[in-house]
C-alpha cells in the first residue's frame, strides 16, 4: 500500500520507497551481513523504511540490494532519484583502505516480475554514486545527517519492466529513499485543442510530435500540434481550433452563447448581443430571430438589425397638364430602419361613372424617369387618355417589403385628365409636283384625342428659313399648294386641330418644284 505524496505534474512515479507502509522486502545478497532494512523517523517524525550497510572495516565488500520488479508503463526512459546519507571515511578510525565513499547503481530489464535471485552478471551499470555531503561523528552527535540527492536516468527501455540494484563496495550508507519515475507532458489544452498525457521520448534531446484534438464545440482552423520535450514540457504550439458557430471561448472551452446572444460563424470572436429588434430563446444561437413585424432581407448579415417595411410616403401632390400628370411626394416618416428605400408607381384607370371599377393602365402610359425602383420622390406620367379618371398609388418599398406588403406602405391620389390636343402627324407625302404646285397628302394623327376639325399646312421657301411662311387650312387629309415658284425648294409642315387646340407640326417635308410636270411621292425626305 502506498500513501500519496505530491510530485510535479509531469512526473509519473513507478516506485517510491517512502510511500510504502510496512517492510519494503527487497532482496539482499548476501542475505545477512550486508544491506539491512531499518525503520527510522523522517523530519516529520513519520517512520520510513531505509536500507543501511556499514561494513567499512572489512575489505572486498560486494553487497547487493535489489528492488522488486518495477513496471515500465510504456516509458522509454526512467529517472532514479536516490536520497542517501554517507559516512565520511576520514571520520572513522582504522578504516583506511577498506572504507569507500561511493556505491554503484545497476539495472536489469526483464519481462519476469518474479525473479527470486540476484544474478550480478545480468545487471548493467548505470553509474557510480558519490556523495556531495558526507557526515562525521560530530554530525551524528548533533543529529545532523546530511542528506544527498542524486538523480540518474536510464533508457531506452523496451521490456515490460526492470529491477534496480545497489552495490556496496565498503561504504557506510543509508538509502533513505528511492524513487523511480518517468516524465510525461501532462494533458493540457492550448488554442482550444486538447493534447493528451504524452510520455517523453527515449533520449534526452528527443521531441515527440503530438496532434491535438479540438475541444467540444470547436473545429480545426489549422491542424493543432505540439511537441513533448524530454523534460516533460510542451513546446511550440502550432495551429489552433475555433469555437463553432453559436459558441465562444471561455476559460479554454467553447461554451454556448447565452440566451439573447448569437455567433454566426466559426471564428475566434465572442458571442454578440442579438441586434435590435431580434432575440434568441435558446443558448447556442447562430442567429437571432426577428421580432414580430420585423424581417431580415436575404442579403442582410446576421449582425444587422431586423427591419420592417417603410410607412407610406407623405405629402403626395399632383399636377395635371392635359394628358400628363406630374407627381411629387416626401419620404416616409418611418423608413423601417433601412437605407435601401425606393418607390413604385401603380397607375389605375377608373370609370367615370363608377370610380371603384379600376383596371391597370397598361403599357401605353409612359413614366419618367421610370415606373419602379424610383430613387427620387417625383415622377412624370405621360400619354394618358383625355377626360379620364386615374388613380396613382406611390408605394414606398425597401429590402423587406416583400415579406409583409401592406396598404399602409402606399399613398394614392385620383386625378382627371383634360382634353388633349392631337398628336403630331407621322407621315406627310408629296403626291404630285409641278412647276407651280405641290399636291400633299397625310395620315391622321395616331392619337387624335377628339374630333379633328381641320388641318393646317405651313410652308416656306427653304432659303427663307421660316422667316416668311404661308398657311393653308383644310378639313381633308390632302391639299394642293399652288402659286409656287419653279425650280425652288419648299419646306412643308402639317398639324391637326381639335377643340382642344392644335397638335404639334409634323416633321418637315422638303420638295423642289419642277420645270416639267411629274408625279412623285415624298415621305418627309428631299423630293425633286
Amino acid at each position: 500500500v502506498t500513501g500519496s505524496r505530491v510530485y510535479p505534474a509531469n512526473e509519473v512515479t513507478l516506485l517510491d520507497s517512502r510511500s510504502v507502509q510496512g517492510e519494503l522486502g527487497w532482496i539482499a545478497s548476501p542475505l545477512e551481513g550486508g544491506w539491512e532494512e531499518v525503520s527510522i523517523m523522517d523530519e516529520k517524525n513519520t517512520p520510513i523504511r531505509t536500507y543501511q550497510v556499514c561494513n567499512v572495516m572489512e575489505p572486498s565488500q560486494n553487497n547487493w540490494l535489489r528492488t522488486d520488479w518495477i513496471t515500465r508503463e510504456g516509458a522509454q526512459r526512467v529517472y532514479i532519484e536516490i536520497k542517501f546519507t554517507l559516512r565520511d571515511c576520514n571520520s572513522l578510525p582504522g578504516v583506511m583502505g577498506t572504507c569507500k565513499e561511493t556505491f554503484n547503481l545497476y539495472y536489469y530489464e526483464s519481462d519476469n516480475d518474479k525473479e527470486r535471485f540476484i544474478r550480478e552478471n545480468q545487471f548493467v551499470k548505470i553509474d557510480t554514486i558519490a556523495a556531495d555531503e558526507s557526515f562525521t561523528q560530530v554530525d551524528i552527535g548533533d543529529r545532523i545527517m546530511k542528506l544527498n540527492t542524486e538523480i540518474r536516468d536510464v533508457g531506452p527501455l523496451s521490456k515490460k519492466g526492470f529491477y534496480l540494484a545497489f552495490q556496496d563496495v565498503g561504504a557506510c550508507i543509508a538509502l533513505v529513499s528511492v524513487r523511480v519515475f518517468y516524465k510525461k507532458c501532462p494533458l493540457t489544452v492550448r488554442n482550444l485543442a486538447q493534447f493528451p498525457d504524452t510520455i517523453t521520448g527515449a533520449d534526452t534531446s528527443s521531441l515527440v510530435e503530438v496532434r491535438g484534438s479540438c475541444v467540444n464545440n470547436s473545429e480545426e482552423k489549422d491542424v493543432p500540434k505540439m511537441y513533448c520535450g524530454a523534460d516533460g514540457e510542451w513546446l511550440v504550439p502550432i495551429g489552433n481550433c475555433l469555437c463553432n458557430a453559436g459558441h465562444e471561448e471561455r476559460s479554454g472551452e467553447c461554451q454556448a452563447c447565452k440566451i439573447g446572444y448569437y455567433k454566426a460563424l466559426s471564428t475566434d470572436a465572442t458571442c454578440a448581443k442579438c441586434p435590435p429588434h431580434s432575440y434568441s430563446v435558446w443558448e447556442g444561437a447562430t442567429s437571432c430571430t426577428c421580432d414580430r413585424g420585423f424581417f431580415r432581407a436575404d442579403n442582410d448579415a446576421a449582425s444587422m438589425p431586423c427591419t420592417r417595411p417603410p410607412s407610406a410616403p407623405l405629402n403626395l401632390i399632383s399636377n395635371v397638364n392635359e394628358t400628363s400628370v406630374n407627381l411629387e411626394w416626401s419620404s416616409p416618416q418611418n423608413t423601417g430602419g433601412r437605407q435601401d428605400i425606393s418607390y413604385n408607381v401603380v397607375c389605375k384607370k377608373c370609370g367615370a361613372g363608377d370610380p371603384s371599377k379600376c383596371r391597370p393602365c397598361g403599357s401605353g402610359v409612359h413614366y419618367t424617369p421610370q415606373q419602379n425602383g424610383l430613387k427620387t420622390t417625383k415622377v412624370s406620367i405621360t400619354d394618358l387618355l383625355a377626360h379620364t379618371n386615374y388613380t396613382f398609388e406611390i408605394w414606398a418599398v425597401n429590402g423587406v417589403s416583400k415579406y409583409n406588403p401592406s396598404p399602409d406602405q402606399s399613398v394614392s391620389v385620383t386625378v382627371t385628365t383634360n382634353q388633349a390636343a392631337p398628336s403630331s402627324i407621322a407621315l406627310v407625302q408629296a403626291k404630285e409636283v409641278t412647276r407651280y404646285s405641290v399636291a400633299l397628302a397625310w395620315l391622321e394623327p395616331d392619337r387624335p384625342n377628339g374630333v379633328i376639325l381641320e388641318y393646317e399646312v405651313k410652308y416656306y421657301e427653304k432659303d427663307q428659313n421660316e422667316r416668311s411662311y404661308r398657311i393653308v387650312r383644310t378639313a381633308a387629309r390632302n391639299t394642293d399648294i399652288k402659286g409656287l415658284n419653279p425650280l425652288t425648294s419648299y419646306v412643308f409642315h402639317v398639324r391637326a386641330r381639335t377643340a382642344a387646340g392644335y397638335g404639334d407640326f409634323s416633321e418637315p417635308l422638303e420638295v423642289t418644284t419642277n420645270t416639267v410636270p411629274s408625279r412623285i411621292i415624298g415621305d418627309g425626305a428631299n423630293s425633286t
Epitope: N216, R250, S251, E253, Q255, K258, I259, G260, Y261, T270, A272, K273, E283
Partner: antibody, heavy 115, light 109 residues
Framework: QSLEESGGRLVTPGTPLTLTCTVS????????MSWVRQAPGKGLEWIGI?????NTYYANWAKGRFTISKTSTTVDLKITSPTTEDTATYFC????????????WGPGTLVTVSS | AIKMTQTPSSVSAAVGGTVTINCQAS????????LAWYQQKPGQPPKLLIY???SLASGVPSRFKGSGSGTEFTLTISDLECADAATYYC?????????FGGGTEVVVK
C-alpha cells in the same frame, strides 16, 4: 429555485475547510456557479466559477488558495490553507443564462479563521 | 483582470431625492454592456437590480435606472425611499473574470 451554503465555522490557520452550496429547483448541468466572499465590513470579492462542464476558473488572487468542485446537487469550495485574511462570509451564486452576472444568491456562510 | 472603480464611496440624500453612482471599468466590458448593479443590505446577500447596463431586473422599481456602455456606467436612483438605504455594487465581466466595484453606501435622510 434556491441556494444554501453550509460548512462555515471557526478554524485555525492552515486547517483546510470545505464549504458546500446545496441547490434546489434547478440543475447544475444547466448553470455555471460562482463563489463570492465578503470580509466583515468590506466589499464583495469574486473567487471563481465552476462551469456546467465541470471545468473551473479562478480569480488570479484565488489560484492555489481555493478549489471548486461539484456533485449533481452541490457545489463545494475548499479553502486549502486558510489564513486570518480568509475570514469572511462566503456566498455561492448562480450565473444567469441571459447575461454575465449572478441572478441567484445563497444567504452566505461565515468562516472565521483564528488561532 | 478588469478593474472596476466605483464613486463615490458614500452618498447621502433626502427622501424623494436622487442619487447617482458611477462605475468606471479599466477596459471595455464584454459586449460593451455586460455590467450589473446589485443592492446589499446588512446581513443579506446582494440583490440584482440592473443587468446588461440598463435592463431592469424582475420586480425592481423603475426608480432604478442604469445607463452607460464601454467603460463608463451609471446607476441613478430617483424618488429615494427609506428602503433604498443600502450598499450598491457594480459587477463587470471581461475575459473570463468578474470584478466587483468597491461599493457605494447610500444614506437616506
Amino acid at each position: 429555485q434556491s441556494l444554501e451554503e453550509s460548512g462555515g465555522r471557526l478554524v485555525t490557520p492552515g486547517t483546510p475547510l470545505t464549504l458546500t452550496c446545496t441547490v434546489s429547483g434547478f440543475s447544475l448541468s444547466s448553470y455555471h456557479m460562482s463563489w463570492v466572499r465578503q470580509a466583515p465590513g468590506k466589499g464583495l470579492e469574486w473567487i471563481g466559477i465552476i462551469y456546467r462542464s465541470g471545468n473551473t476558473y479562478y480569480a488570479n488572487w484565488a489560484k492555489g488558495r481555493f478549489t471548486i468542485s461539484k456533485t449533481s446537487t452541490t457545489v463545494d469550495l475548499k479553502i486549502t490553507s486558510p489564513t486570518t485574511e480568509d475570514t469572511a462570509t462566503y456566498f455561492c451564486a448562480r450565473e444567469s443564462s441571459t447575461f454575465y452576472g449572478m441572478d441567484l444568491w445563497g444567504p452566505g456562510t461565515l468562516v472565521t479563521v483564528s488561532s | 483582470a478588469i478593474k472596476m472603480t466605483q464613486t463615490p464611496s458614500s452618498v447621502s440624500a433626502a427622501v424623494g431625492g436622487t442619487v447617482t453612482i458611477n462605475c468606471q471599468a479599466s477596459q471595455s466590458v464584454y459586449g460593451n454592456n455586460e455590467l450589473a448593479w446589485y443592492q446589499q443590505k446588512p446581513g443579506q446577500p446582494p440583490k440584482l437590480l440592473i443587468y446588461t447596463a440598463s435592463s431592469l431586473a424582475s420586480g425592481v422599481p423603475s426608480r432604478f435606472k442604469g445607463s452607460g456602455s464601454g467603460t463608463e456606467f451609471t446607476l441613478t436612483i430617483s424618488d429615494l425611499e427609506c428602503a433604498d438605504a443600502a450598499t450598491y455594487y457594480c459587477l463587470g465581466y471581461k475575459s473570463d473574470d468578474y470584478t466587483f466595484g468597491g461599493g457605494t453606501e447610500v444614506v437616506v435622510k
